[in-house]
């Protein structure tokens, strides 16, 4: 796991605690929460995230507005469970024993249950749609400059593989980016699309995981790119078994924050 | 050399408290984990939790969440454990150790407790 | 929680002979498991960190081995000093928590 090795601190995710005692006596950091390690190499996994936010000393936790609110009673802020490597299990419940299924970012795909419930297999999220609306500029942003700030920002800060940044798209005032990763081409080491869409969320919250560094300052050809309204869908490559009369509402997952 | 020494056994009631110290020297106290760890008479280790001295960040083991409190002094490197509200199934000997694979280890503080 | 189970309980062993102590992790931990010693009266003490990592100070004989759910401890030869009681410890995630111990006994 490696880190900063002079002051052994986490470049990539600051809910963590970091000490001179991994293996070889190298800088180990932990993830609030979990306590496990974390490869500060590259991005923490959305569920070590969510169960470090929900450990945070109350009065440190940032409150969840009441406009962030997710669809599809997608529960957004919830303690996860985490398997031994840090992923969602596939299947998660609450302290009062009401269980439902999650897709690999977190997000609920099944109607609630019992302790009865099964979920097989975590079932990949292949397909995420960031739907952005920026502040009012004075023109239009030029698209294809707008489209390369975009890719380097997934590919710089997030380490996003460019091949997983499938488009964007851009009617003024709307910015849509469309990540995809289907399980066969996610090989080891590269990271999720559902952690980067993560860090992006919380950047754009200005909530950044990101140690000691800014907050994002996203501009394009010099001029500030503002978001007032941030809407995440996600698509899973089996799709959410929600009751019939659910599906007639909504087709798929979405997370609605302002 | 590293040296992490405790204070002296106790004697307490049932429903009292205790609290034990371990003061910690030749290494740079902030920056490592500290945990707690008992031992029943005949039994085997059991971790209470931890703490990082640096922010004073600290973790119990769910079984003594309730009643447990890890502090530190960081001016005289010293770390902390209270254990409210004693039983006498709580009668064992109190370790701190230091960092993730406990490297160093106090010499331990009897507590017992008895009506 | 991560359980560990060390086995056997009791092994019964002469000086000279080789032990093999054996801890099994409930899931995945990797390498972060830690072996110690422990005699009457007195402290546990590190023999091996990271499953493997040796540890200034003890003796040569003490290895360990293993990863993911599956850890030796292995003395090569033992010596008197060696008849103890044996645990294993996890740091993959909190609790930590040991093994229920082995204790190493003269035949």
């Known amino acids: 796991h490696t880190a900063a090795q002079d002051n052994c601190t986490c470049p990539t995710n600051k809910m963590t605690v970091c000490s001179p005692d991994g293996p070889g006596g190298r800088c180990q950091c932990r993830a609030l929460g979990s306590g496990m390690a974390v490869d500060c190499s590259t991005l923490t996994s959305k569920c070590l995230l969510l169960k470090a936010r929900m450990s945070a000393p109350k009065n440190a936790r940032t409150l969840v507005r009441p406009s962030e609110h997710a669809l599809v009673d997608n529960d957004g802020l919830y303690d996860p469970d985490c398997d031994p490597e840090g992923r969602f299990k596939a299947r998660q419940c609450n302290q009062t024993s009401v269980c439902w299924c999650v897709n690999s970012v977190g997000v609920r795909r099944t109607d609630k249950g019992d302790l009865s419930l099964r979920c097989d297999e975590l079932v990949r999220t292949h397909h995420i749609l960031i739907d952005l609306r920026h502040r009012p500029t004075a023109g239009a942003f030029n698209h294809s400059d707008l489209d390369a700030e975009l890719r380097r920002l997934f590919r710089e800060r997030y380490r996003l593989h460019p091949k997983f940044v499938a488009a964007v798209h851009y009617e003024q005032p709307t910015i849509q980016i469309e990540l995809r990763q289907n399980t066969s081409q996610k090989a080891a080491g590269d990271v999720d699309i559902g952690d980067a869409a993560y860090y992006f969320e919380r950047d754009i919250k200005g909530e950044s995981l990101f140690q000691g560094r800014g907050g994002l300052d996203l501009r394009v050809r010099g001029e500030p790119l503002q978001v007032e309204r941030t809407l995440i869908y996600y698509l899973d490559e089996i799709p959410p078994k929600f009751s019939m009369k659910r599906l007639t509402h909504h087709h798929h997952h979405h997370h609605h924050h302002h | 050399q590293v040296q992490l020494v405790q204070s002296g056994a106790e004697v307490k009631k049932p429903g009292a408290s205790v609290k034990v110290s371990c003061k910690a020297s030749?290494?740079?106290?902030?920056?490592?984990?500290i945990h707690w760890v008992r031992q029943a008479p005949g039994q085997g280790l059991e971790w209470i939790g931890t703490?990082?001295?640096?922010?004073?960040?600290?973790v119990y083991n769910q079984k003594f969440r309730d009643r447990a409190t890890m502090t530190r002094d960081r001016s005289i490197s010293t770390a902390y454990i209270e254990l409210s509200r004693l039983r006498s199934d709580d009668t064992a000997v109190y370790y701190c150790?230091?960092?993730?694979?406990?490297?160093?280890w106090g010499q331990g503080t009897t507590v017992t407790v008895s009506s | 929680e991560i359980v560990l189970t060390q086995s056997p309980a009791t092994l019964s062993l002469s000086p000279g002979e080789r032990a093999t102590l054996s801890c099994r992790a409930s899931?995945?931990?990797?390498?972060?498991i830690h072996w110690f010693q422990q005699k009457p009266g007195g402290s546990p003490r590190l023999l091996i960190k990271y499953a493997s990592e040796s540890i200034s100070g003890i003796p040569s004989r003490f290895s360990g081995s293993g990863s993911g759910t599956d850890f030796t401890l292995t003395i090569s030869s033992l010596e008197p000093e060696d008849f103890a009681v044996y645990y294993c410890?996890?740091?993959?995630?909190?609790?930590?928590?040991f093994g229920q111990g082995t204790k190493l006994e003269i035949k």
């Open positions: 703490i990082f001295p640096s922010n004073a960040y600290a």
């Open positions: 899931q995945n931990i990797g390498t972060s």
């Open positions: 030749g290494y740079s106290f902030t920056t490592h984990w």
């Open positions: 410890q996890h740091s993959h995630s909190w609790p930590f928590t």
């Open positions: 150790a230091r960092a993730s694979y406990f490297d160093y």
